[in-house]
Interface confidence: medium
Amino acid sequence: LRHVVYWNSSNPRLLRGDAVVELGLNDYLDIVCPHYEGPGPPEGPETFALYMVDWPGYESCQAEGPRAYKRWVCSLPFGHVQFSEKIQRFTPFSLGFEFLPGETYYYISVPTPESSGQCLRLQVSVCCKERKSESAHPVGSPGES
């Protein structure tokens, strides 16, 4: 399964911070960065860095300390940018992350200094089963971006 998350401040549940996505092993979490056609909003485009953090970092929406891992940067608001995280128990890649069944992982975005964005938060709950099929389950929508 591919679970698509449109990561932008038009997504009410990401804003509130109580969005939950349930993923199984071998699923993919696809993060779609904000995208603008033309000049973008008057307050400027949303650009940010996405981090995986621990619970205190999620609560405070702060990506600091040894348990904050920068995963991606959405810094090209006029391009089509998407990142993917494979939910797997073991990873062959040095930049990959290993996910344990039954655990919850926390993602936050920290706006860049020049950005109009707000703090956005997502909880990823990893379930137990390995899945083989592929279909899409988006969270959020392209919204205004």
Partner: antibody
Amino acid sequence: QVQLKQSGPGLVAPSQSLSITCTVSGFSLTTYGVDWVRQSPGKGLEWLGVIWGGGSTNYNSALKSRLSISKDNSKSQVFLKMNSLQTDDTAMYYCASDWAYWGQGTLVTVSA
Amino acid sequence: DIVMTQSQKFMSTSVGDRVTVTCKASQNVGTNVAWFQQKSGQSPKPLIHSASYRYSGVPDRFTGSGSGTDFTLTITNVQSEDLVAYFCQQYKRYPYTFGGGTKLEIK
């Protein structure tokens, strides 16, 4: 334009079950979570539960034994079913998409 | 369950005034608090999330603040259409719970 429209019976007899349908437009149910809330003069606003885009649910533990939330993505419909209604279940029942968009409400009266 | 207490069921104010609606949580909820406005006969409308962030389209005369257990919704330059009910909600823990509401009335 996001809209949620509710349909369901206005009057339910005690001990019977309640079914309300929330039909959404302007977005896909695989996109956002949908919460159910009820409001009564006695209990105020009370969160009943949520169904997430992927289909998983969370319920208010006080009502979990008689509450069920399900959906049909292809028909853009979310269903609330509550069993064994009593008079204190009389309330306005709302569906809400990610708290930003709300249905118009369904007034449910439990009475013989 | 976390209890959200809005101690004032009614508050009197005048158009142009500044009014502060309070909400107290029975335990620490961080900043996982939202505020809703409800006009008579209508569904609740979200105003504030994460204790202090306005939703898009909400006038800037509405300001939320607080963290932990004490939260406020401040309305500056109150307009006649603001004389309705306001509810706080915590979403730190299931079940999500609401305050009993505060209705603004004309002095």
